[in-house]
């Protein structure tokens, strides 16, 4: 069976029907490049005016304008708000009332696209494997990133969150139109990774999405993540404005000027430092969501009532922090280089600025407890990775899971830890699952490109697709079309239940209280320490225009000791950055 031309609110669209075997039978209808909105520079998205005739939806559209990985050029385009749909079809009748899974990509709110990284036309976010194996409709889409998606003056002149509003427009488009493709508009699951996972979280918290979202999956990221909300957007707006020659004293004039500035210039005016800085790299993620009093009306921690009826899966990778550790403490990945106590203390103090000297010392002490009996470099490097994983991913996710569970009415809550080790040959032997390592398994790459993977990788992928799509279908990862290797029990506040996802998933994979000692430290001990600075996110502008990152704060109340200068070789940002 195949859909043929489909009538949407914008007009007719026609995709391609791809047979899944030479013998005929099952197939998948694929639509690429359907417009869901339009947007002017630094303005909220508007509904698309539509078209006459039949739109040939056969090619991915260009990504939203963003800097290249080298950050010295741009690619993509401003006209980028398009979505892609995969609809699995059986032999006889066209599919009807299928669950819908809407993917939100990651990329630090700075990069990425709905189709994902591409190698020889093999796109990372190709929805075919999920759609056909799980019998669900998969939707991916583009949203604006970087300054064009998130620049904000912190007031009505440039409220920001344009990228979040693009995401909302895509979700709302799916709600209104997906029935025509055979989807159930009342069963939409949004899922995403890293910045996409935080976006998923923010979309569930936003009052704009009331009634649109049935379920959600956040993979390595939450609205509560320290890198997910910009507390000082005006500082960064001024930084960009100065670089492109716009006035900075009056936000109205600044906004008006920025809106007529070449979008490429705006994009290139910001560079994420990829060499070690005074502060951890996440402090320099400038263009990210803001609390605008509208789309995100309040601090995310106060918005969990809005998720009371949204089923949620949230989890992290067991070494999510590794990617960030390699930038902040480059020696982590270098066998011939050593991590010192000073290196780690400097990292800790950079992540605990708000609590000053006491916060840094308490945190340093608990994380280095094991160093007395095992002062090996392997243990110290693992500690650095564990610390970054905790601060950036685990703790925010655990707090969010607890909040979701506490506010739940009809909603169910599930937690996981992805522990299938990275396949990167250059990584240390002790390496676990790095940030973004889960993506290939969720999107079925071990099946799509079998020669690049082992049977154990296919086992992981099969299990994840089964749990994810069952959850989309029923709200329970165990119940649906796909058999699962073991029963995944819901998260409870008492036990902190989570599924440990490895190559062999058994009943023993259901575990409790992940890193409970550290969770208690952050939630209780650290939390009650007095705050010593007004705003840990305030960075002063660079004095030299050529400087990549702003200087650290020059606030007298800043009590962060500066460790000795580290002359070690500085690591470059990996080309496959996923956050």
């Amino acid at each position: 069976a195949k859909l043929g031309a489909v009538y949407t609110e914008g007009g007719f669209v026609e995709g391609v029907n791809k047979k899944l075997s030479l013998l005929g039978g099952d197939s998948v209808d694929i639509f690429k490049g359907i417009p869901f909105a339009t947007a002017k520079t630094l303005e909220n998205p508007q509904r698309h005016p539509g078209w006459q005739g039949t739109l040939k939806a056969t090619n991915f559209k260009k990504r939203c304008l963003q800097a290249t990985i080298t950050q010295d050029n741009t690619y993509g385009q401003e006209d980028c708000l398009y979505l892609n749909i995969w609809v699995p079809q059986g032999r006889k009748q066209v599919s009807h009332n299928l669950p819908v899974m809407v993917w939100i990509y990651g990329g630090a709110f700075l990069m990425g696209s709905g189709q994902g990284a591409n190698f020889l036309k093999n796109y990372l976010y190709d929805g075919e494997e999920i759609a056909t194996r799980g019998n669900v409709i998969v939707v991916t889409f583009n949203y604006r990133v970087g300054p064009l998606g998130f620049l904000s003056t912190g007031d009505a002149n440039l409220p920001g969150n344009f990228g979040l509003r693009d995401q909302h427009m895509a979700i709302a488009w799916v709600k209104r139109n997906i029935a025509a493709f055979g989807g159930d508009p009342d069963n939409i699951t949004i899922f995403g990774e890293s910045a996409g996972a935080a976006s998923v979280s923010l979309q569930t918290l936003s009052p704009y999405n009331k009634g649109l979202i049935r379920r959600a999956i956040s993979q390595s990221g939450m609205a509560l993540s320290p890198w997910a909300i910009q507390k000082n957007p005006l500082f960064w707006a001024k930084t960009i404005a100065k670089k492109v020659g716009c006035p900075t004293e009056d936000t109205g004039k600044m906004a008006a000027c920025l809106k007529i500035t070449d979008p490429r210039a705006l994009t290139l005016a910001y560079k994420l430092p990829v060499k070690k800085q005074e502060y951890p790299v996440v402090h320099y993620l400038a263009f990210i969501p803001v609390i605008d009093g509208d789309f995100i009306p309040d601090d995310p921690i106060n918005l969990y009532n809005n998720t009371a009826d949204i089923d949620y899966i949230a989890g992290i990778n067991n070494m999510d922090g590794h990617l960030f550790a390699t930038i902040d403490v480059p020696a982590v990945d270098k066998t011939k280089q050593t991590v010192t106590e000073e290196d780690f203390y400097r990292l800790v103090s950079g992540h605990t600025v708000a609590k000053g000297l006491k916060g840094a010392q308490a945190t340093f002490d608990i994380y280095t407890e094991s160093w007395a009996q095992d002062p090996s470099q392997e243990n110290m490097k693992k500690t650095v990775v564990a610390f970054e994983t905790d601060v950036l991913f685990l703790i925010p996710t655990e707090i969010a899971l607890a909040q979701h569970k506490a506010h739940a009415k009809s909603a169910k809550t599930y937690s996981y830890l992805f522990s299938h080790p990275s396949r990167m040959p250059i990584y240390p032997k002790w390496m676990g699952a790095d940030h973004a390592d889960d993506l290939q398994y969720v999107f079925g790459k071990p099946f799509a490109t079998p020669l690049g993977y082992r049977p154990q990788d296919r086992a992981v992928s099969k299990a994840m697709i089964a749990y994810w799509t069952n959850f989309a279908r029923s709200g329970d990862p165990n119940m649906g079309n796909s058999p699962v290797p073991t029963h995944w029990y819901p998260y409870t506040l008492e036990n902190g239940n989570y599924l440990d996802i490895t190559k062999t998933i058994t009943s023993a994979s259901m575990k409790e209280h992940l890193r409970e000692k550290f969770l208690k430290f952050w939630a209780v001990t650290f939390e009650v320490l007095p705050t010593v600075t007004g705003d840990q996110d305030t960075l002063t502008p660079p004095e030299d225009d050529s400087e990549v990152a702003p200087d650290p704060p020059s606030d007298d109340s800043q009590v962060v000791p500066v460790p000795p200068t580290d002359d070690s070789v500085e690591a470059q940002m990996p080309a496959t950055i996923g956050f």
């Epitope: 043929g4 031309a5 489909v6 009538y7 949407t8 609110e9 914008g10 007009g11 007719f12 026609e14 509904r47 698309h48 005016p49 539509g50 078209w51 006459q52 005739g53 039949t54 709302a172 488009w173 709600k175 209104r176 139109n177 029935a179 025509a180 009634g211």
Partner: antibody
Amino acid sequence: QVQLVQSGAEVKKPGASVKVSCKASGYTFTSYNMHWVRQAPGQGLEWMGVINPGDGATSYNQKFKGRVTMTRDTSTSTVYMELSSLRSEDTAVYYCARDYYGSSPLGYWGQGTLVTVSS
Amino acid sequence: DIQMTQSPSSLSASVGDRVTITCSASQSISYMNWYQQKPGKAPKLLIYDASSLASGVPSRFSGSGSGTDFTLTISSLQPEDFATYYCHQRSSTPTFGQGTKLEIK
């Protein structure tokens, strides 16, 4: 100027079929979608479906699926709506209506065709 | 399908009156239009995209709203305005409101 001229009134028996035509003029026929909307006596408007005259693509209201067929003849700039298995509740005025622009409202309407289904 | 609920279903007014008709959608919509229909005639487009006036339509007609709630306003009723008014949402399955009959008081 844009004109949509529909065929005349029809009286049909239950179970029969009816085919209503709508001849377009004053614009490029293949450039705009054509919709069919019906209105039962004293009732509101009900969308039946749409055809793209360019390639013949159609989409029907689920309510009429299996009973309605929309076709077009580009040589005469005419669209047709055929409704089968007629029942008394199909008695209505049937309108063809052309899109205004883009994905737009129904900007131009035919004069309507009364179809009466009676035994 | 998206349901459109119009209110009131009928109303009496006098020439020169200001009249407001509302339409509520069962979910947020993108494309909202208003039509006028007189007895024995085809509907006529008045307002498209919630607030844009169709060509040839007098400026006393205006539309507003977004999301789920929309309004058609006639600022000063004229004798030729007595008719039935329909709201209409454009989606993959377009639907109409049940109509508002505007009668002379």
